[in-house]
Amino acid sequence: APRQRQSTLVLFPGDLKTNLTDRQLAEDYLYRYGYTRVAEMHGDSKSLGPALLLLQKQLSLPQTGELDSATLKAMRTPRCGVPDLGRFQTFEGDLKWHHHNITYWIQNYSEDLPRAVIEDAFARAFALWSAVTPLTFTRVYSRDADIVIQFGVAEHGDGYPFDGKDGLLAHAFPPGPGIQGDAHFDDDELWSLGKGVVVPTKFGNADGAACHFPFTFEGRSYSACTTDGRSDGVPWCSTTANYDTDRRFGFCPSERLYTQDGNADGKPCQFPFIFQGQSYSACTTDGRSDGYRWCATTANYDQDKLYGFCPTRADSTVIGGNSAGELCVFPFTFLGKEYSTCTSEGRGDGRLWCATTSNFDRDKKWGFCPDQGYSLFLVAAHEFGHALGLDHTSVPEALMYPMYRFTEEPPLHKDDVNGIQYLYGSRPEPEPRPPTTTTPQPTAPPTVCPTGPPTVRPSDRPTAGPTGPPSAGPTGPPTAGPSTTTTVPLNPVDDACNVNIFDAITEIGNQLYLFKDGRYWRFSERRGSRLQGPFLIADTWPALPRKLDSAFEEPLSKKLFFFSGRQVWVYTGSSVLGPRRLDKLGLGADVAQVTGALRRGGKMLLFSGRRFWRFDVKAQMVDPRSASEVDRMFPGVPLDTHDVFQYQEKAYFCQDRFYWRVSSQSGVNQVDQVGYVTYDILQCPED
């Protein structure tokens, strides 16, 4: 039989190998996380045995008292920096908040994730705790906040330094004044949502979705954006696991697409360009002391003085090695062979790496490619537990277990809920509601709704994919016709409180209308009736489909606009105009649905995915030049809201069962509450 090819192992310059012995690692760990001090108090300072037993008990490991492989593995697992036994130090007060409206301030950001993703991760992490307690969490913009959130490296202003990549991920302090209550995240980590770097795309046909790493293209696996398959050098990625089958793609941040800041209005780099008489064919840090990469946006900087900063590429910014922070260069030569994606060749540990020049053999410049990263949402949810007064648990499945473990399951365990409810109690039961009426008698004027399923269709934008135009996807199953019966037997599905996600929510005549599968409910805080319904959409607005994406009432004319898929209906009283295609409103073919609307200064804003437009109700046209990114005007709301509506002069952005409420003060929009649609808006009782 042919011999298996031996992989050549190479000594990589700057590859940091820890020189700590197992015993040194154990001593350091046991001291840092409070085990040695507790063991010493019980009179044994020479042997590690008692401290190891404490650790094994606390972390639910086999209690051998030995430095065995399971214990060493646990000690090498990334974790929270808060000690397991005892505390960092003595703290002031009884270590719980004595008010329920907790405020938080995001003092700074990591560059690993877009700001909106960071804000969303924190908001979702707080929402976990507010869902099971009477606590609410409001984002504020000053250090007077109860919880200050900070990304820092090494010594970062609290006397408890971070330790570089991996190891200690974050720490937080128990409730109280000053540093107490604050949560700090190690910015030497790669922060992600737990499944690799988050690279939002532009253009292409995936409506700004993030890259999916790794992805398959022409049978090869890619863990970073690539220029393969294109002749223009613009990096792209697939937004699903397999481009070959799904053909969904977008372009990655690139100086060939745009630049940031500077003075060139975001124009792309011009390569080559002249700077101080020299020619540059790539972004450079020359002429700057801060290490920021820049380029000229005309052929001659010396003459035109026009420049911009090159977008950072999280997917190919290397970690460690001897070129930390630099970009992978593809293709690169290694041992005489060319590589156009990260590789583990030459390494015994299987870690992916790349060269940061075109030739590793010559320059020996390299770094590790980004790994899966740590989920900022999960780590934040854990740290916020500390900021609310929780200690570590010994239940390995619980969120408050000290070790990091990625999961896509709901992270709160019964143990976490018991702990937080011991401190603050459970969510208060709303006052009892009268029974919902079963014979609907709609009193509101009818409104308009769309007629197709809200499946997002592929964009018809003419930008070709890396290997040709994307193939059009299915347009979704046909919607069922409207039901003809008007009364429905009492049934759990008739209770709006049992609806997980509504199709559409809108305010009509000071009442909230909630639509789901051909039916709707009305809710009013001001009237004794609270929730009424369900009513049949077909009885009130016969022209509408069962499934709506969004709706709004124009306050002056009282016209009701209903959207479904690529269609819109406009009801004035009981007369209807439509269905009309969204094109008639000036929305391009790449807008697959309208997901919501808000009133702003005499005009409406129409939302679709991550974008919105100004809509002139009189003219029934959007201003095509008004297209804007949601996260620019509404920082901190989720990037993938399925419904946007206005209620009592505040904007609500819905994602899953949650809403993000946005208030506007002197032109500044800020999230002031995150909660459940059912519990917090409809005041449903909890199970």
């Epitope: 130090q89 002031e92 700074n108 250090r143 970062h156 006397g159 408890y160 540093i179």
Partner: antibody, heavy 115, light 107 residues
């Protein structure tokens, strides 16, 4: 309300050591770090060092060998000790509470190094 | 150590004018810059923290901006009582360091 008050010797002979106490009220040393800053006559501010809530310290690298900061949480006092003073150590010495900036300062204590 | 450079030791302005003081860090300090005002014979007073946040009670004519290495402190309409020395300081990494100060003089 928050207050910090430095008390020092005023006059120190060259090569002698300096001890200054900063007594704080209105907040706990368990919740806020305290920094020391000095200002020579007619000059700018020079950061000396900090003691964090847990007792960890960081120092100005140029002065590290002669500087030591400690505290007594129960008495709400922070101590600055500096050895081998020379005439260019003449300055007003301030303690300041820290929380994303030094938000409260003492009135300062004037130290003159002279024989 | 990180060096904070305030390029102007003195700036002369008139009441009602807008004035901007710059501060440059020798390396990236993110947004961890504070600005202090020190009037003759007084202790410094924190005006701006984290580059752009006004401290409680500070008039809104005082603003700060910047991130990375370049920071600006602005008084939108100078008042007579703004006569003072203004210092920037980085608190990104110890040792924390101050700029040399800019003395604002009123014409």
């Amino acid at each position: 309300q928050v207050q910090l008050k430095e008390s020092g010797p005023g006059l120190v002979a060259p090569s002698q050591s300096l001890s200054i106490t900063c007594t704080v009220s209105g907040f706990s040393l368990l919740s806020y770090g305290v920094h020391w800053v000095r200002q020579p006559p007619g000059k700018g501010l020079e950061w000396l060092g900090v003691i964090w809530t847990g007792g960890t310290t960081n120092y100005n690298s140029a002065l590290m060998s002669r500087l030591s900061i400690s505290k007594d949480d129960s008495k709400s006092q922070v101590f600055l000790k500096m050895n081998s003073l020379q005439t260019d150590d003449t300055a007003i010495y301030y303690c300041a509470r820290y929380y994303y900036g030094m938000d409260y300062w003492g009135q300062g204590t004037s130290v003159t190094v002279s024989s | 150590d990180i060096v904070m450079t305030q390029s102007h030791k003195f700036m002369s302005t008139s009441v009602g004018d807008r004035v901007s003081i710059t501060c440059k860090a020798s390396q990236d300090v993110r947004n961890t810059v504070a600005w202090y005002q020190q009037k003759t014979g007084q202790s410094p007073k924190l005006l701006i923290y984290s580059s752009s946040y006004r401290n409680t009670g500070v008039p809104d004519r005082f603003t700060g901006s910047g991130s990375g290495t370049d920071f600006t402190f602005t008084i939108s309409s100078v008042q007579a009582e703004d006569l003072a020395v203004y210092f920037c300081q980085q608190h990104y990494i110890t040792p924390y360091t101050f700029g040399g100060g800019t003395k604002l003089e009123i014409k």
